[in-house]
């Protein structure tokens, strides 16, 4: 059993040396071998070595100020342990009552402004010693603030402001925030962006879809956790090796950037969710065939985006070699069977029901226990609601009565 | 502050090329896209494409394609653009924008004239 | 041959409203947000209102732009002297694939 020290002498004891070294030179040695009880969340060596150099040599080049501040902002004035840091916490630290954000995670996991524990409960004398994985850099800032200051997020702000979303990423919260960087809405096609900024409900829906109204520090990614996003849907965070995944994308270009009101990741796509994509960008790889010939036989020119529609998508293999080399009027028909004139969500079709086309034909909706059809063809799972409509999928081509 | 500073007027004789240049101060060239712009003297504006600085990505407009070619060079924060095959309608100012596709063109060079003429 | 389409001239005097209107089709502006440039006589075109209705930093609140199906328009109120200059309303084409711009119209302050 290891003899029970100070706080200054534990930080020997489980090796965070260059912590200790800091800390006898800031003058904080006197106080934490004295009275007064303390939890020190005391960056590893390795973590001191993968600070930024300028930033590290601006603290060692003024220890009585900079350092002395950096290291109390590691510092609580009571002792916790970890079973007493709680998820969603905020405990004010001994420089300027600069609060702390625990996360404890249903993965044992517990972080410190996105720090993890990674040998935690060391009990001193006067206190108790977590080591933890990385330096706290000040936090004075809110997510705001770093938007509005970080020029590669320029194209972010502008349209932050533009769906009033940035005010509100400056109020209190435990926000995360999966910030598109320049280049991300560069890869975006131009009329894409064009479309969803010129829809007020399309572009702030856009912009909800990026973030979480919980803390999520890269740390406590494990597997494929799925979260809700203020917008309404939920995206899937992973990880892939030391990269984390959003719906299923290696796409965190920078993670973990601490903020007062909540965490930023930077992301090289942008996210757009179903309901900012018009309806013919909801359908899938299974569906190509069907929107390839809406495409080409001019049908999406009538799919406009202040309109609404359903389109009622057969997969793939429900097209055979023989259809596709119908006449191009007949086959036009025969999609026209597929694109109904109002826009009609899975939880409003009901038995009996009767849907008009945009070629002027009616559709029957049968309701069975397993299976919702129409006419001779029932859906597969995978229905979504765009902006301007919905997408059901079929296993076979509509054929009307 | 913001400035595109574009090269100085040219004179050209048909189916020659020409190179414009569009030097950026004032903020990170490579957080932000360049879109060329023409104008013919007493007429209108005419888009005639874009090119990321951030990797050289570009979008020409269908009209200019096969004969326009836009490029940057990080290192001195310059985006040029390169006209072929130039033809007597093509004499106009050519102006570049600062583009960052949210928010379109925010700010210009001051122009730069471009005459053909045999 | 401009795509979107805008009445060639509109005057005021100072002090009044004018309004600049812009018509396009489903492909451009029924699809996609407008842009307004203003050209002062001589120089360089300037943004005006982006993405139908927002004014960048520095412009006056006496600029403001709609967009309703496939039209939109930009009003100045409060019409001053050093208003006249020539406005192009501009959005994206799905069609062509390209950035399109309006005729262009002439403010003049009587």
């Known amino acids: 059993v290891l003899p029970i020290d100070h706080v200054y002498g534990t930080l020997g004891i489980v090796g965070a040396t260059t912590t200790q070294r800091y800390s006898d030179a800031s003058k904080l040695r006197e106080e934490i071998e004295g009275k007064g009880s303390f939890t020190y969340f005391a960056p590893s060596n390795e973590a001191w070595d993968n600070l930024d150099s300028d930033i590290r040599r601006g603290l060692e080049s003024n220890v009585n100020v900079e350092l002395l501040n950096a290291l109390h902002s590691h510092m609580i004035n009571k002792r916790m342990l970890t079973k007493d840091l709680k998820n969603g916490m905020i405990i004010p630290s001994m420089y300027n009552n600069l609060g702390l954000f625990i996360n404890h995670y249903p993965n044992g996991v517990v972080t410190v402004n996105c720090a993890r524990i990674i040998h935690g409960n060391q009990i001193a004398t006067n206190g108790v010693v977590h080591v933890i994985d990385r330096v706290l850099t000040q936090i004075g800032t809110s997510i705001q603030d770093f938007i509005e200051a970080e020029d590669d997020l320029s194209s972010f702000r502008a349209a932050a402001i533009t769906s009033d979303i940035l005010e509100a990423l400056g109020r209190d919260g435990h926000f995360t925030l999966f910030a598109p960087t320049n280049e991300a809405f560069e890869k975006l096609p131009r009329g894409v962006l064009e479309r969803i900024m010129g829809d007020k409900v399309a572009s702030e829906a856009l912009m909800k879809y990026h973030i979480l109204n919980t803390l999520q520090c890269s740390e406590s990614i494990m597997g494929g956790a799925v979260f809700e996003t203020l917008e309404g849907n939920t995206i899937e965070i992973g990880c892939d090796g030391d990269s984390i995944t959003v719906n299923g994308i290696k796409m965190v270009n920078k993670k973990d950037i601490v903020t007062n009101n909540g965490v930023i990741h930077l992301i090289d796509q942008v996210l757009i969710p179903d309901s900012a994509k018009q309806v013919i960008e909801l359908a899938g790889k299974q569906q190509t065939t069907f929107t390839d010939l809406v495409a080409q036989l001019g049908l999406a020119s009538a799919l406009r985006p202040d309109g609404e529609y359903t389109l009622l998508a057969p997969v793939n293999n429900a097209f055979s070699d023989d259809t596709l080399s119908m006449d191009q009027r007949l086959l036009k028909l025969i999609l026209q069977n597929h694109i109904l004139k109002v826009k009609v969500g899975l939880n409003e079709l009901y038995n009996g029901q009767i849907l008009e086309t945009i070629g002027g034909k009616q559709l029957r909706v049968f309701v069975y226990r397993t299976a919702v059809c129409i006419e001779n063809s029932c859906m597969e799972k995978g229905s979504k609601q765009g902006r301007n409509g919905a997408i059901h999928i079929f296993r076979e081509i509509i054929k009307p009565a | 502050q913001v400035q595109l500073v574009q090269s100085g007027a040219e004179v050209k004789k048909p189916g020659a090329s020409v190179k414009v240049s569009c030097k950026a101060s004032?903020?990170?060239?490579?957080?932000?896209?360049i879109s060329w712009v023409r104008q013919a003297p007493g007429q209108g504006l005419e888009w005639m494409g874009w090119?990321?600085?951030?990797?050289?990505?570009?979008n020409y407009a269908q009209k200019l394609q096969g004969r326009v070619t836009m490029t940057t060079d990080t290192s001195t924060s310059t985006a040029y653009m390169e006209l072929r095959s130039l033809r007597s309608d093509d004499t106009a100012v050519y102006y570049c924008?600062?583009?960052?596709?949210?928010?379109?063109?925010?700010?210009w060079g001051q122009g730069t004239l471009v005459t053909v003429s045999s | 041959q401009s795509v979107l389409t805008q009445s060639s001239s509109a005057s005021g005097t100072p002090g009044q409203t004018v309004t600049v209107s812009c018509s396009g089709s489903?492909?451009?502006?029924?699809?996609?947000?407008v842009n307004w440039y203003q050209q002062l006589p001589g120089t360089a075109p300037k943004l005006l209102i982006y993405?139908?209705?927002q004014r960048p930093s520095g412009v006056p609140d006496r600029f403001s732009g709609s967009k309703s199906g496939t039209s939109a328009s930009l009003a100045i109120s409060g019409l001053q002297s050093a208003d006249e200059a020539d406005y192009y309303c501009?959005?994206?084409?799905?069609?062509?694939?390209?950035?399109?711009f309006g005729s262009g119209t002439k403010v003049t302050v009587l």
């Open positions: 501009a959005a994206w084409d799905d069609s062509l694939s390209t950035y399109v």
């Open positions: 090119i990321s600085a951030y990797n050289g990505n570009t």
């Open positions: 993405s139908n209705d």
């Open positions: 004032g903020y990170t060239f490579t957080s932000y896209g």
């Open positions: 924008a600062r583009d960052m596709l949210v928010v379109p063109f925010d700010y």
């Open positions: 489903s492909s451009d502006i029924g699809s996609n947000r």
